[in-house]
């Protein structure tokens, strides 16, 4: 399954939107930094394309869920959020088209399920952090920075998969 060229453009637009969403000076938020334990090994180059697409799909779905909450709506600019949702939705569609084609359904399903579970647990840690920090502006900025980093790392994986073809 070949992801369209527009998919990587959409990924870059997503990162740009995340950068634009910033609302306060980040220098005041240093004390709120947190280790969310991004499961980097689940996005390693050792995986085949068949195995990574469902994991990438899970990653983007979880980002969508995180920023679709009422707490998120209160934290960010509504216009930017709407554009952000649109970009994520398009990327989910692109990845779903590959999943539907049955790519990787029979290949190492346990490895794939473990990776998906690791991504879900990562987002659970992010959600718990926000709750503990009472959804403060700094907590949201820390999460936004973390999502930019993890999304960027997963996007790099997509690019490396494309270049291997």
């Amino acid at each position: 399954c070949d992801l369209p060229q527009t998919h990587s453009l959409g990924s870059r637009r997503t990162l740009m939107l995340l950068a634009q969403m910033r609302r306060i000076s980040l220098f005041s938020c240093l004390k709120d930094r947190h280790d969310f334990g991004f499961p980097q090994e689940e996005f390693g180059n050792q995986f085949q394309k068949a195995e990574t697409i469902p994991v990438l799909h899970e990653m983007i779905q979880q980002i969508f869920n995180l920023f679709s909450t009422k707490d998120s709506s209160a934290a960010w600019d509504e216009t930017l959020l709407d554009k952000f949702y649109t970009e994520l939705y398009q990327q989910l569609n692109d990845l779903e088209a590959c999943v539907i084609q049955g790519v990787g359904v029979t290949e190492t399903p346990l490895m794939k399920e473990d990776s998906i579970l690791a991504v879900r647990k990562y987002f659970q840690r992010i959600t718990l952090y926000l709750k503990e920090k009472k959804y403060s502006p700094c907590a949201w900025e820390v999460v936004r920075a973390e999502i930019m980093r993890s999304f960027s790392l997963s996007t790099n994986l997509q690019e490396s998969l494309r270049s291997k073809e």
């Epitope: 950068a19 980040l26 004390k31 930094r33 280790d35 820390v142 973390e146």
Partner: antibody, heavy 121, light 107 residues
Framework: EVQLVQSGAEVKKPGESLKISCKGS????????IGWVRQMPGKGLEWMGI????????AYSPSFQGQVTISADKSISTAYLQWSSLKASDTAMYYC??????????????WGQGTLVTVSS | DIQMTQSPSSLSASVGDRVTITCRAS??????LNWYQQKPGKAPKLLIY???SLQSGVPSRFSGSGSGTDFTLTISSLQPEDFATYYC?????????FGQGTKVEIK
């Protein structure tokens, strides 16, 4: 390979202006902040200030506020430290270093080689 | 500003010795503390971040501990290349501040 390359040594007279640079390569320049550190001859490290190159937001140590200006040009992945009127007491080695911002990652993990600034009449 | 105080300011030790340097913050900094090594004429090098995390490529003889206001850098068995000046730095709030440094010299 991540690198921060600083401009060469400078010899200036009191009252002159100066702008030194720090060019980042091998990583996404806007994903990290750039900090500046002073080390006077035979002395310890002093933190001067920091810049977020993604939007040029800056913060200074009170000791250096109004004495220096930190800027960045993200189009050429370069941060700057400048003086409008140098004093003899500005004679020091100046280092730039990258910082991961709000991300959980090693602070100041890569440093420039340093720029020696000598101010003498 | 948060003040960082290192002790001792200098120490003499022999190759193979266990060396301990302490750093005290004027207020709680949780675990937001870094340790750097600097050799003459060179840029500082990050050894430990977040109080106890070993930076990639740094030998395991270096370790860090502590939280709140009191922190320690330990070199388990001093090597010839470890003779240098060591600095702690708080990373919880701006302005970031460094300790005054500890010079480790050959006995």
């Amino acid at each position: 390979e991540v690198q921060l390359v600083q401009s060469g040594a400078e010899v200036k007279k009191p009252g002159e202006s100066l702008k030194i640079s720090c060019k980042g390569s091998g990583y996404s320049f806007t994903s990290y902040w750039i900090g500046w550190v002073r080390q006077m001859p035979g002395k310890g490290l002093e933190w001067m200030g920091i810049i977020d190159p993604s939007d040029s937001d800056t913060a200074y140590s009170p000791s250096f506020q109004g004495q220096v200006t930190i800027s960045a040009d993200k189009s050429i992945s370069t941060a700057y430290l400048q003086w409008s009127s140098l004093k003899a007491s500005d004679t020091a080695m100046y280092y730039c270093a990258r910082h991961p911002g709000l991300n959980w990652a090693p602070d100041f993990d890569y440093w420039g080689q340093g720029t020696l600034v000598t101010v003498s009449s | 500003d948060i003040q960082m105080t290192q002790s001792p300011s200098s120490l003499s030790a022999s190759v193979g010795d266990r060396v301990t340097i302490t750093c005290r913050a004027s207020q709680s900094i949780n675990r937001f503390l870094n340790w750097y090594q600097q050799k003459p004429g060179k840029a500082p090098k990050l050894l430990i971040y977040a109080a106890s995390s070993l930076q990639s490529g740094v030998p395991s003889r270096f370790s860090g501990s502590g939280s709140g206001t009191d922190f320690t850098l330990t070199i388990s068995s001093l090597q010839p290349e470890d003779f240098a000046t060591y600095y702690c730095q708080q990373a919880i709030d701006l302005p970031f501040t460094f300790g005054q440094g500890t010079k480790v010299e050959i006995k």
